[in-house]
Interface confidence: medium
Amino acid sequence: IGLLYPFPRDCSQAMLNGDTTSGLYTIYINGDKTQALEVYCDMTSDGGGWIVFLRRKNGREDFYRNWKAYAAGFGDRREEFWLGLDNLSKITAQGQYELRVDLQDHGESAYAVYDRFSVGDAKSRYKLKVEGYSGTAGDSMNYHNGRSFSTYDKDTDSAITNCALSYKGAFWYKNCHRVNLMGRYGDNNHSQGVNWFHWKGHEYSIQFAEMKLRPSNFRNLEGRRKRA
């Protein structure tokens, strides 16, 4: 029997092909076999089918990087990594995606889901769109909606000071942040660490964080697979 999606464009299609174990998979942007991309798929959280695009867990990877690095991506997809803004832009241009953020700290966990998520192209400086919050972590990403991405060498935030420089990270900073998941791991100084303001505030660096995306209509697709 042939695969439902011979060239899956995201982890949800890989899952609908029958792959239900979290791990590394190859996806194909727009289903084009020449645009292969290795990603980590979370096949367990809330039904699975998520492309993980950020993971913080131990501080071994340096996230204080330049524009070029954030555009391309860096790190080990099994460990700490950033998938890359160019990849995120291409993936979210394929259709309507939702964002999930999973946070864990000393046995506590929280999550946030935004049912409309996209990252613009390089020309827009990878402008963020996040709407339709639900979850337990609090709506911290709302502050960053509509912002362009900023790194220490390309300052697109609305603050007079360079937010990425001030907080030793990179993000869709505004003036400056409520979310700083690419901040300094383990740094509990005000606004410097891995922060999700509405969960742990600005003076606490969260131990584990993942950002992930999947198609907004995944539930419908999943039902179709089960019926099939």
């Epitope: 603050a159 000071t161 606004s191 509405h198 600005h202």
Partner: antibody
Framework: QVQLVESGGGLVQPGRSLRLSCAAS????????MHWVRQAPGKGLEWVSG????????YYADSVKGRFTISRDNAKNSLYLQMNSLRAEDTALYYC?????????????WGQGTMVTVSS | DIQMTQSPASLPTPVGDRVTITCRAS??????LNWYQQKPGKAPKLLIY???NLETGVPSRFSGSGSGTDFTLTISSLQPEDFATYYC?????????FGQGTKVDIK
């Protein structure tokens, strides 16, 4: 706990100047943006000015732009509002407020206010 | 500047009743909407920030909702200590602006 105490208010003639101060305690002062908000007698609240935690960014309402200057001395845990060319419509109770974060965001905790009366 | 319009201006309500105050922004402000309570002779007190986040220490009978341009503050069961004036405020852009206030008094 957070404490904000305003001072410097009083009766002043139109066209003259006044400098308000706000002494802050109970929190790390330079970690938070600060605001001045005023309330004319029997009226609603009007945001006047704000300043980021570092003091690098300042913001003003159109009604006071060019006349009022906000500043802070992080070493002294103090916030200031220099008010020049005062008008009768500047008569109000002036509150100093601590923001919820280091950036211009949400006025969270307020002082009890200092009264400014502009009259000849 | 963004104009904030609250309604009603006055709301006579019996103790125990549900109270709903609405606030409309003149332009889209995402969820950057805060609610304050002010009692006579006292400083305003933050109740809700970012449309729906309850400030620490504020009773759970207070709740906020809305996004974009239309927002609501709800008091599920009015208590005697809740009689006050309530203001909405947008922190989406500077200058930050307040609504004209809603006075909740005893019916």
């Amino acid at each position: 706990q957070v404490q904000l105490v305003e001072s410097g208010g009083g009766l002043v003639q139109p066209g003259r100047s006044l400098r308000l101060s706000c002494a802050a305690s109970g929190f790390t002062f330079d970690d938070y943006a600060m605001h001045w908000v005023r309330q004319a007698p029997g009226k609603g609240l009007e945001w006047v000015s704000g300043i980021s935690g570092s003091g690098g960014s300042t913001y003003y309402a159109d009604s006071v732009k060019g006349r009022f200057t906000i500043s802070r001395d992080n070493a002294k845990n103090s916030l200031y509002l220099q008010m020049n060319s005062l008008r009768a419509e500047d008569t109000a109770l002036y509150y100093c407020a601590k923001d919820i974060s280091a950036v211009m965001d949400v006025p969270q905790t307020w002082g009890q206010g200092t009264m400014v009366t502009v009259s000849s | 500047d963004i104009q904030m319009t609250q309604s009603p201006a006055s709301l006579p309500t019996p103790v125990g009743d549900r109270v709903t105050i609405t606030c409309r922004a003149s332009q889209y402000i995402q969820g950057f909407l805060n609610w304050y309570q002010q009692k006579p002779g006292k400083a305003p007190k933050l109740l809700i920030y970012d449309a729906s986040n309850l400030e620490t220490g504020v009773p759970s009978r207070f709740s906020g909702s809305g996004s974009g341009t239309d927002f609501t503050l709800t008091i599920s069961s009015l208590q005697p200590e809740d009689f006050a004036t309530y203001y909405c405020q947008q922190s989406y852009s500077t200058p930050q602006t307040f609504g004209q206030g809603t006075k909740v008094d005893i019916k």
